[in-house]
């Protein structure tokens, strides 16, 4: 069963997925989709690479770690509560079924509603903001690109790591972040 | 307007060989996945093969593997299936469809009969 | 393989009722479920994919819902063109694979 990852609404959500390149800038095409993976490719697809470069992406959604190196984690900013749901990381490894597949699952917590400080019984609550995604249409018919000709040492999505959207966040604030779309 | 249009069917012996060609068109056939599906009298839908385009990957239902060979031509817009030692349990009606996961649109159809 | 059942076999409605169609998998496939129509002689149409989602050009009247091995194709008021066979197909699972179908039928 997919792995659950946890963030608070207005937070950005982190969700991990990691391969190692057979060697340095032999990059393997990889697409994120909202929705569990599908048989092919990616369905809904929020974010995509090539062999090179981020080759599409939507509003919200990047890659903070250093892609080249096989860290193609996702980020989803300023989550909302409809951001829940799976989402799939899809390693395309060239070569027939050899692509590796993972769920993570996205678990979206109402934000911690803080007082104001009060007098006598009057309060006031922060009610955060409920906002919808936009839908996205059939994407994962079409393809782009070729695959190239490379052999992977190790895929992993760290399970047992970075669990936590703070943790992630706490890590990626450490150090430089180049922020892709 | 998308539209794909098969052709090839016919009547074959057992252990003969029937190439199937689809015609595509209305939409930008070199950047989509391309799937065949056939359909035998009285039986459900079963997904048959695919190719992805760009790529190259192929992938085939094991009941036809080492048999059948999709294959496309995109100077031509046109998706065939290459179909080879046939028998009885190929008879269907096969279509052509656009897509990976699911599929749209279809074409008409061409019907295939196996038989001495 | 995944093993995607329909019920009923056949569904006799009359036009302007609500028809539900549901589609059942051996196993869970999550939200990767499409249904199809087809009526004689013709290609299957593309309904829904996502298990929800309208395919373009599909009137407001098909809606499909459920998630991992319950699904339901509902029809909110059938029209006289909407008797036809319909199918579910799921693709989570190598390899990819259909419902034996629904007949609709009029009453």
């Known amino acids: 069963s997919e792995v659950e990852y946890r963030a608070e609404v207005g937070q950005n959500a982190y969700l991990p997925c990691f391969y190692t390149p057979a060697a340095p800038g032999n990059l393997v095409p990889v697409c994120w989709g909202k929705g569990a993976c599908p048989v092919f490719e990616c369905g809904n697809v929020v974010l995509r690479t090539d062999e090179r470069d981020v080759n599409y992406w939507t509003s919200r959604y990047w890659l903070n770690g250093d892609f080249r190196k096989g860290d193609v984690s996702l980020t989803i900013e300023n989550v909302t509560l409809a951001d829940s749901g799976i989402y799939c990381c899809r390693i395309q490894i060239p070569g027939i079924m050899n692509d590796e597949k993972f769920n993570l699952k996205l678990v979206i917590k109402p934000a911690k509603v803080t007082p104001a400080p009060t007098r006598q019984r009057d309060f006031t609550a922060a009610f955060p903001r409920m906002l919808t995604t936009r839908g996205h249409g059939p994407a994962e018919t079409q393809t782009l690109g070729s695959l190239p000709d490379i052999n992977l040492t190790q895929i992993s999505t760290l399970a047992n790591e970075l669990r936590d959207s703070r943790l992630a966040n706490d890590l990626r604030d450490s150090g430089a972040t180049i922020r892709i779309g | 307007e998308v539209q794909l249009v098969e052709s090839g069917g016919g009547l074959v012996q057992p252990g003969g060989s029937l190439r199937l060609s689809c015609a595509a068109s209305g939409f930008t056939f070199s950047t989509y996945w391309m799937t065949w599906v056939r359909q035998a009298p009285g039986k459900r839908l079963e997904w048959v093969a695919n190719?992805?385009?760009?790529?190259?990957?192929?992938y085939y239902v094991d009941s036809v593997k080492g048999r059948f060979t999709i294959s496309t031509d995109n100077a031509k817009n046109s998706l065939y299936l290459q179909m080879n030692s046939l028998r009885a349990e190929d008879t269907a009606v096969y279509y052509c469809a656009r897509g990976s996961n699911w599929f749209d649109p279809w074409g008409q159809g061409t019907l295939v009969t196996v038989s001495s | 393989e995944i093993v995607m059942t329909q019920s009923p076999a056949t569904l006799s409605m009359s036009p302007g009722e609500r028809a539900t169609l549901s589609c059942r998998a051996s196993?869970?496939?999550?939200?990767?479920l499409a249904w199809y129509q087809q009526k004689p002689g013709q290609a299957p149409r593309l309904l829904i994919y996502g298990a929800s989602t309208r395919a373009t050009g599909i009137p407001a009247r098909f809606s499909g819902s459920g998630s991992g091995t319950e699904f339901t194709l509902t029809i909110s008021s059938l029209q006289s063109e909407d008797f036809a066979l319909y199918y579910c197909q799921q693709y989570t699972h190598w390899p990819i694979t259909f419902g034996q179908g629904t007949r609709l039928e009029i009453k």
């Open positions: 196993q869970s496939v999550y939200d990767n």
């Open positions: 190719i992805k385009q760009g790529g190259g990957d192929k």
